[in-house]
């Protein structure tokens, strides 16, 4: 048997081209110079290499760059990026948004993989904060990206970046995340007029405190029930029947359909039945007339 480690005569690759697709895996390993591969990475994507052949090429790059690939190579990885492990990616130092975009493009249409999550993490940490351009890029590829971050990570998002956020980007955010994002959104949109402000702030309201909801109720915003149902329960409870009526406007009728669900259910339990009756919706479960309501939390605070 011929020892298959040395490149056969006449097979040494002079450039990365189509002729390589019919090289055996061991021939690719023996005949393709890793430095040549690194400088011509952009050509790899145009050549229909098999999955196995791509592994050989990756192995050559790994041997050439044991400490991690330089950005000049990373930017042109193309489909070879799909072969990288999170451990590989942790060795990288990606600073260019163009590089990030190029790699996200490769994974487009698929769910966020561990590789992509690691890449984004490395990129954002390298930048120090989640700036507007980065957020624009990430939410364009992954609408749920923002909601995948921890509240701690979200705290590094500058208010200016909030302009890039679309309502669908917040669909999977939980209250803890909205608690962090809401004050940033409020700051970002503070110079807008009433109706425009409400359109922009609406998807962040799951993090709004009671006083902001009270203020909104004075502005004829006509909040829809879907938004109301996402509000923090502790923020809704102190609202009066009149305030909720103003906040919802014509949508107030929707309370009946939601009376068994939070936060409506809990809010009803805190209202006087007399006040609820004024809505004419047949909401039941309020405090009967003649009962005295003691706010124990207030009493504790005073003592």
């Amino acid at each position: 048997e011929v020892e298959k480690t040395a490149c056969p005569s006449g097979k040494k690759a002079r450039e990365i081209d189509e002729s390589l697709i019919f090289y055996k895996k061991w021939e690719l390993e023996a005949c393709v110079d890793a430095a040549l591969l690194a400088t011509q990475m952009d050509r790899v994507n145009a050549i229909p290499f098999t999955y196995e052949q791509l592994d050989v090429l990756k192995h050559k790059l790994d041997e050439l760059y044991p400490q991690g690939y330089p950005e000049s190579v990373i930017q042109h990885l193309g489909y070879l990026f799909l072969k990288m492990s999170p451990e590989d990616i942790r060795k990288w130092n990606v600073t260019s948004l163009e590089t990030l975009k190029a790699l996200l493009e490769v994974n487009k249409g698929h769910e966020m993989s561990p590789q992509v999550a690691t890449l984004i993490d490395r990129f954002v940490k390298g930048r120090g904060q989640l700036d507007k351009d980065t957020l624009d890029t990430l939410t364009a590829f992954y609408p749920g990206y923002l909601c995948s971050l921890s509240p701690e990570e979200l705290s590094s998002v500058p208010p200016s970046s909030i302009w890039a956020v679309r309502p669908q980007d917040l669909d999977t955010c939980d209250p803890r995340q909205l608690d962090v994002l809401y004050p940033k959104a409020r700051l970002a949109f503070q110079n807008m007029n009433g109706s425009e402000y409400f359109v922009k702030i609406q998807s962040f309201l799951g993090g709004a405190p009671t006083e902001d909801l009270k203020a909104l109720s004075q502005q004829n915003v006509s909040m829809d029930l879907a938004t109301f149902m996402k509000l923090r329960t502790d923020a809704v409870l102190p609202l009066t029947v009149a305030e909720v009526q103003k906040l919802l406007g014509p949508h107030v009728e929707g309370l009946k359909a939601e009376e068994r669900h939070r936060p409506v259910r809990d809010w009803i339990l805190r209202q006087r039945q007399d006040d609820l009756d004024t809505l004419g919706l047949g909401l039941q479960g309020g405090i009967p007339n003649g009962y005295l309501v003691l706010d124990l939390s207030m009493q504790e605070a005073l003592s």
Epitope: K4, K25, W26, E29
Partner: antibody, heavy 122, light 110 residues
Framework: QSQLVESGGGRVQPGGSLRLSCAVS????????MGWVRQAPGKGLEYIGY???????YYASWAKGRFTISKDNSKNTVYLQMNSLRAEDTATYFC????????????????WGQGTQVTVSS | ALQMTQSPSSLSARVGDRVTIKCQAS??????LAWYQQKPGKPPKFLIY???DLASGVPSRFSGSGSGRDFTLTISSLQPEDFATYYC????????????FGTGTKVTVL
């Protein structure tokens, strides 16, 4: 003289798991690819997958997810982990070496082990 | 997905006959093809690689030809020990394929 000996076969219930081993001698796993092939009674050869010298694994489309190939170079042993076994997985399981010292499956399988029988039934 | 089709599935022949077995790939695989011989109760035996190169110790009556999609295994003069099942195998792409082996051709005594 290169030798391959499979072990770990036997009877297993549907839904169960089994790990087959292939002990090799006469060559190094860091220089050769190793594959697994099975053959149901009276049927043809069916490729399961292989592991290259550098540890990258490749599988038949039907085997992905249920079957896992691994190796321990220091123990000169290759493994086939089989999960969620079904009656149709009943077969003789062969391990085989890549014939080429290039370390990938480039030329074919040679030599082969004698095989180990796996029966899946309740 | 890359598939291998072998024909015929079985054939009967006499000692001394010339036997030809065909293997077709669903796409071009260059010369990345191997042939095996298998007898009942035994593991396969490696016969040919690179479509036409004889493996070590294989008698010269066995030969292989073809490139691209169509391949042939020929036994020039069938011997008693050649009655067996023959399989082709593509080694061009071994990832995520249904099977790298052909369906097999059983050669029996006429």
């Amino acid at each position: 003289q290169s030798q391959l000996v499979e072990s770990g076969g036997g009877r297993v219930q549907p839904g169960g798991s089994l790990r087959l081993s292939c002990a090799v001698s006469g060559f190094s796993l860091s220089s050769y690819a190793m594959g697994w092939v099975r053959q149901a009674p009276g049927k043809g050869l069916e490729y399961i997958g292989y592991i290259s010298k550098i540890g990258t694994t490749y599988y038949a489309s039907w085997a992905k997810g249920r079957f896992t190939i691994s190796k321990d170079n220091s123990k000169n042993t290759v493994y086939l982990q089989m999960n969620s076994l079904r009656a149709e997985d009943t077969a003789t399981y062969f391990c085989a070496r890549g014939s080429s010292s290039g370390g990938y499956l480039d030329d074919g399988f040679d030599p082969w082990g004698q095989g180990t029988q796996v029966t899946v039934s309740s | 997905a890359l598939q291998m089709t072998q024909s015929p599935s079985s054939l009967s022949a006499r000692v001394g006959d010339r036997v030809t077995i065909k293997c077709q790939a669903s796409q071009s695989i260059s010369n990345y093809l191997a042939w095996y011989q298998q007898k009942p109760g035994k593991p396969p035996k490696f016969l040919i690689y690179d479509a036409s190169d004889l493996a070590s110790g294989v008698p010269s009556r066995f030969s292989g030809s073809g490139s691209g999609r169509d391949f042939t295994l020929t036994i020039s003069s069938l011997q008693p020990e050649d009655f067996a099942t023959y399989y082709c195998q593509q080694v061009y792409d071994s990832n995520n394929v249904e099977n790298v082996f052909g369906t097999g051709t059983k050669v029996t005594v006429l």
